[in-house]
Interface confidence: low
C-alpha cells in the first residue's frame, strides 16, 4: 500500500513510510483540539488488494467550550448553533435591559482545551435619572429618584400670572428609553398668542374666537368674486405666528379677449401647473378662473360652501 489516508481531525502516529506491506497496520490519534469518543476504530490495515481498509475521523470530535446558560434577562445565542472552538457566542439582553461586558465571546483553543475568550456578560436593568425640570411647569413623579425602562412622566404647565395661559410646547409625556435616555427632550411652557387673523374679502368658517393660543386652527373662505391665495387653514405656532401665513382673497379678474388655459377637473398634488386656487406664491392670474366644478371655485350663482368638494 502507498501512504495511508490523511484526515482533518486525526493524524498518523509516527512517521509515514513510502509503502507498507500487506497486513501492516497504522494507528491514528486525534489532532490537537479534538478528542476521541469510542467505539469507532482509529487504525487501518493494508489490505490484500493493496488498499487501506476503510477508516474515518468520525471518532474525533472537536473540543467544545463549556456550556453557557442564558444570562438573566437575556439570551446567549451560539452564532452557528455550536459550542465548538472557532465559533462565536452572541449575547442579547431582553428589552429593558442593557449589556455589561462583551457582546460576543469566541471559543478559542488554549493548548488542547477549548475555552471562551472572556467572561459572559450580564444584563442590567435600564434605569434613568429624573427627567429635566422645566420653567413654568412641572412633571409627575417629581419625588422619584430612579426610573425604570418605559416608566413615563407627564408634564403640565403652571397657572399663568397674567390674562393669557401658558401653553405646553412639545410632547407632554416622555418615557425612560433604551440607553437610559429619556425618549425625547422635555417640553416647554410659555405664553403663545397669535394676532387676530384678518382676511379682507373673506371670512372665517371655523375656529372662531377672540384670542388665538398655541395650536389654534382657523379656516377661511373668500367672498363671491374672490379666490384664495394661500392656504385655507392656518395654525398658531409656538412662535406666536400663523403657519402657513394668513392667506389673501384676491379678486377674480374679468375675462380677457384671449381664451384661458384649460384646467384639469381633477386636482393632483403632484401637478406641475398649479391653479390659482392652490398657488401660494407666484404671479397673480390675469384670466378669470373657469366657473366649472373645479374644487374650490363656486359654480355660477352658488355660494362657495355649496361647491366645496
Amino acid at each position: 500500500c502507498e501512504e495511508p489516508p490523511t484526515f482533518e481531525a486525526m493524524e498518523l502516529i509516527g512517521k509515514p513510510k513510502p509503502y507498507y506491506e500487506i497486513g501492516e497496520r497504522v494507528d491514528y490519534k486525534c489532532k490537537k483540539g479534538y478528542f476521541y469518543i469510542p467505539p469507532l476504530a482509529t487504525h487501518t490495515i493494508c489490505d490484500r488488494n493493496h488498499t487501506w481498509l476503510p477508516v474515518s475521523d468520525d471518532a474525533c470530535y472537536r473540543e467544545t467550550c463549556p456550556y453557557i446558560r442564558d444570562p438573566l434577562n437575556g439570551q446567549a445565542v451560539p452564532a452557528n448553533g455550536t459550542y465548538e472552538f472557532g465559533y462565536q457566542m452572541h449575547f442579547i439582553c431582553n428589552e429593558g435591559y442593557y449589556l455589561i461586558g462583551e457582546e460576543i465571546l469566541y471559543c478559542e483553543l488554549k493548548g488542547s482545551v477549548a475555552i471562551w475568550s472572556g467572561k459572559p456578560p450580564i444584563c442590567e436593568k435600564v434605569l434613568c435619572t429624573p427627567p429635566p425640570k422645566i420653567k413654568n411647569g412641572k412633571h409627575t413623579f417629581s419625588e422619584v429618584e430612579v426610573f425604570e425602562y418605559l416608566d413615563a412622566v407627564t408634564y403640565s404647565c403652571d397657572p399663568a400670572p397674567g390674562p393669557d395661559p401658558f401653553s405646553l410646547i412639545g410632547e407632554s409625556t416622555i418615557y425612560c428609553g433604551d440607553n437610559s435616555v429619556w425618549s425625547r427632550a422635555a417640553p416647554e411652557c410659555k405664553v403663545v398668542k397669535c394676532r387676530f387673523p384678518v382676511v379682507e374679502n373673506g371670512k372665517q368658517i371655523s375656529g372662531f374666537g377672540k384670542k388665538f393660543y398655541y395650536k389654534a386652527t382657523v379656516m377661511f373662505e373668500c367672498d363671491k368674486g374672490f379666490y384664495l391665495d394661500g392656504s385655507d387653514t392656518i395654525v398658531c405656532d409656538s412662535n406666536s405666528t400663523w403657519d402657513p401665513p394668513v392667506p389673501k382673497c384676491l379678486k377674480v379678474l374679468p375675462p380677457s379677449s384671449t381664451k384661458p388655459p384649460a384646467l384639469s377637473h381633477s386636482v393632483s398634488t403632484s401637478s406641475t401647473t398649479k391653479s390659482p386656487a392652490s398657488s401660494a406664491s407666484g404671479p397673480r392670474p390675469t384670466y378669470k378662473p373657469p366657473v366649472s366644478n373645479y374644487p374650490g371655485y363656486p359654480k355660477p350663482e352658488e355660494g362657495i360652501l355649496d361647491s366645496l368638494d
Partner: antibody
C-alpha cells in the same frame, strides 16, 4: 402593547410562491432572534427557520432548506418568510415567534393551504 | 417522527397531579441544552409555559413546574384545573435546529 401581527396566508397551488409577514409592535425585531414555526392541521409544532438578531445568521429546517427564505426589514419592524416551490406538505398554520433559545412571544398564526 | 419523545396523551381528575415526560438524546437535551415547555389551548397560538428547564414566565401559576435530568425532562402540573386542558410541547435545541416534541394532549376528567 407588545405583540406580533401576522399577514400573508392563503390558498396557493403547488409549485407557487407566497410571502408571510409578521409586524412587531412594542419592541424592535433587530434586538432579538426571530423564528417561524408551523403546525400542520391536527399535528404538532415544527420549527421552520430563524434569523439571528444581527441578521447575519439564518438557519432552516431540512424540510424547507433551499425553498424558504427568512428576512426582516428593520425600518418596518417586520419579519418575513418567502416560501417558494410550495408543496402539499407545507400546508399548515405558520406562526412567527420572538426569542433565542425559547419563544416568549408568538403571533396568532396564519393559515397557508397548498392545494391544486 | 419527533426527535423529542412525549406521550401522546395524559389525563387526570381536577386537583390531581400529572407529569408529562420528554425524552431526547445526547445530542440535544443530554448535550446540556435547555428544555422549554409550551401550552397550546384549543384554537390558539402556543404560549411559553416553562423556560430554561424550570423557570416560569410572569403570569404562569406556580402549579406548573419543570425539571431536567440527563437526556430527559418533565413537566409537572399540580392541582389540576379544567382550564389546563390543552396540548403541551417540550422544546430543545441541537446544532442549528430548534426541536419540538410531538405534543401531549392533557385531558381533565
Amino acid at each position: 402593547q407588545v405583540q406580533l401581527v401576522q399577514s400573508g396566508g392563503g390558498v396557493v397551488q403547488p409549485g407557487r410562491s407566497l410571502r408571510l409577514a409578521c409586524a412587531a409592535s412594542g419592541f424592535t425585531v433587530n434586538n432579538y432572534a426571530m423564528h417561524w414555526v408551523r403546525q400542520a392541521p391536527g399535528k404538532g409544532l415544527e420549527w421552520v427557520a430563524v434569523i439571528s438578531y444581527d441578521g447575519n445568521n439564518k438557519y432552516y429546517a431540512d424540510s424547507v432548506k433551499g425553498r424558504f427564505t427568512i428576512s426582516r426589514d428593520n425600518s418596518k419592524n417586520t419579519l418575513y418568510l418567502q416560501m417558494n416551490s410550495l408543496r402539499a406538505e407545507d400546508t399548515a398554520v405558520y406562526y412567527c415567534a420572538k426569542g433565542g433559545g425559547y419563544f416568549d412571544l408568538w403571533g396568532r398564526g396564519t393559515l397557508v393551504t397548498v392545494s391544486s | 417522527q419527533s426527535v423529542l419523545t412525549q406521550p401522546p396523551s395524559v389525563s387526570g381528575a381536577p386537583g390531581q397531579r400529572v407529569t408529562i415526560s420528554c425524552t431526547g438524546s445526547s445530542s440535544n437535551i443530554g448535550a446540556g441544552y435547555d428544555v422549554h415547555w409550551y401550552q397550546q389551548l384549543p384554537g390558539t397560538a402556543p404560549k411559553l409555559l416553562i423556560y430554561g428547564n424550570n423557570n416560569r414566565p410572569s403570569g404562569v401559576p406556580d402549579r406548573f413546574s419543570g425539571s431536567k435530568s440527563g437526556t430527559s425532562a418533565s413537566l409537572a402540573i399540580t392541582g389540576l384545573q379544567a382550564e389546563d386542558e390543552a396540548d403541551y410541547y417540550c422544546s430543545s435545541y441541537t446544532s442549528g435546529t430548534w426541536l419540538f416534541g410531538g405534543g401531549t394532549k392533557l385531558t381533565v376528567l
